[in-house]
Interface confidence: medium
């Protein structure tokens, strides 16, 4: 025997008490599948949440976060955006560890400080969690006759002579 409630479409509920009539969902509620005996209450996007998609009789509201906050999980929580000197992890905003930095507001990851000694440069200014180190000039920059503004020669494609 077919369940008469299976004929109730999404956006309605099957009212047991009224000979299984398909009644429309009450205000601020929805049913996304047919045959439901009650309607789910709509999610309300309040406070730091803002409405990304309005609730309809057949689908729930969807929220995102107000500027300065970001979603966690399926946007079940809004967390303050990370400041410079932090990065977003599964556990939330974490301060960059020693030797790394993030200079971006709200986004980005902690990146290692530049290693000045790799190209023989000295450290002019120590790095922080928010700023990279400032390296001194390279030895080549300091050699006589060197010009730091000489443009590189343009590359030529083989087999082509200049016009």
């Amino acid at each position: 025997l077919q369940d008469p409630c299976s004929n109730c479409p999404a956006g309605t509920f099957c009212d047991n008490n009224r000979n299984q009539i398909c009644s429309p969902c009450p205000p601020n509620s929805f049913s996304s599948a047919g045959g439901q005996r009650t309607c789910d209450i709509c999610r309300q996007c309040k406070g730091v949440f803002r409405t990304r998609k309005e609730c309809s009789s057949t689908s729930n509201a969807e929220c995102d976060c107000t500027p300065g906050f970001h979603c966690l999980g399926q946007c079940t929580r809004c967390e303050k955006d990370c400041r410079p000197g932090q990065e977003l992890t599964k556990q939330g905003c974490k301060t960059c560890s020693l030797g790394t930095f993030n200079d971006q507001n709200g986004t980005g990851v902690c990146r290692p400080w530049t290693n000045c000694s790799l190209d023989g440069r000295s450290v002019l200014k120590t790095g922080t969690t928010e700023k990279d180190v400032v390296c001194g000039p390279s030895p080549a920059d300091l050699s006589p006759g060197a010009s730091s503004v000489t443009p590189p020669a343009p590359a030529r494609e083989p087999g082509h002579s200049p016009q």
């Epitope: 009644s23 009650t38 789910d40």
Partner: antibody, heavy 117, light 107 residues
């Protein structure tokens, strides 16, 4: 015939987490909601929270930080977890089916929970 | 949260009496009100939903009325099996809240 049956530990120590299960027979959790209600000794009924057919939840704002309601549709079970228990959580805990325009048409018999060391 | 206040908290009446129980909401709840009966053994049953709609199987001596903030449950002729505590419950706004209950006894 629709039946709801609560099962719980009976006695729980303060600061521990309470875990109660509501087993539903003769009714589908994908069509109906389930609401948890408790009643301290000699006092009135207090709504704790609801899980909807779609799986979303709403909680009593005063208890929200301590409550988790979840369900397993295939087992027809709804579970209530409440953390950081105190003596004030000693009560009879009921689950009830939510239907129609949000009335509780079938109730479980209740399970007694005592919080004591 | 919406506060629900019931009066009286207890009452004693004779068999066959007409009994009325009042329920007041701290703000307007339209007709979004249900009534429940809790027997001395703890069993809870739905009596009336949406202010005045009788749940299936509930005797016709029970009736409900009201709108907005003030509601009434009436038992037209008290029977021995009506000894119980009666609760109103609003579902206008989450969290859904119950009244404090009215304990009904037989004189």
């Amino acid at each position: 015939q629709v039946q709801l049956q609560e099962s719980g530990p009976g006695l729980v120590k303060p600061s521990e987490t309470l875990s109660i299960t509501c087993t539903v027979s003769g009714s589908s959790l994908t069509s109906y909601g389930v609401h948890w209600v408790r009643q301290p000794p000699g006092k009135g009924l207090e709504g704790l929270g609801v899980i909807w057919p779609g799986g979303s939840t709403n909680y009593n704002s005063a208890l929200m930080s301590r409550l988790t309601i979840s369900k397993d549709n295939s087992k027809s079970q709804v579970s209530l977890k409440m953390s950081s228990l105190t003596a004030a959580d000693t009560a009879m805990y009921y689950c009830a089916r939510v239907t129609g325009t949000w009335y509780f048409d079938v109730w479980g018999q209740g399970t007694t929970v005592t919080v004591s060391s | 949260d919406i506060q629900m206040t019931q009066s009286p908290s207890s009452l004693s009446a004779s068999l066959g009496d007409r009994v009325t129980i009042s329920c007041s909401a701290s703000q307007g709840i339209s007709n979004y009100l249900n009534w429940y009966q809790q027997k001395p053994d703890g069993t809870v049953k739905l009596l009336i939903y949406y202010t005045s709609t009788l749940h299936s199987g509930v005797p016709s001596r029970f009736s409900g009325s009201g709108s907005g903030t003030d509601f009434t449950l009436t038992i037209s002729s008290l029977q021995p099996e009506d000894v119980a505590t009666y609760y109103c419950q609003q579902y206008s706004k989450l969290p859904w809240t119950f009244g404090g209950g009215t304990k009904l006894e037989i004189k």
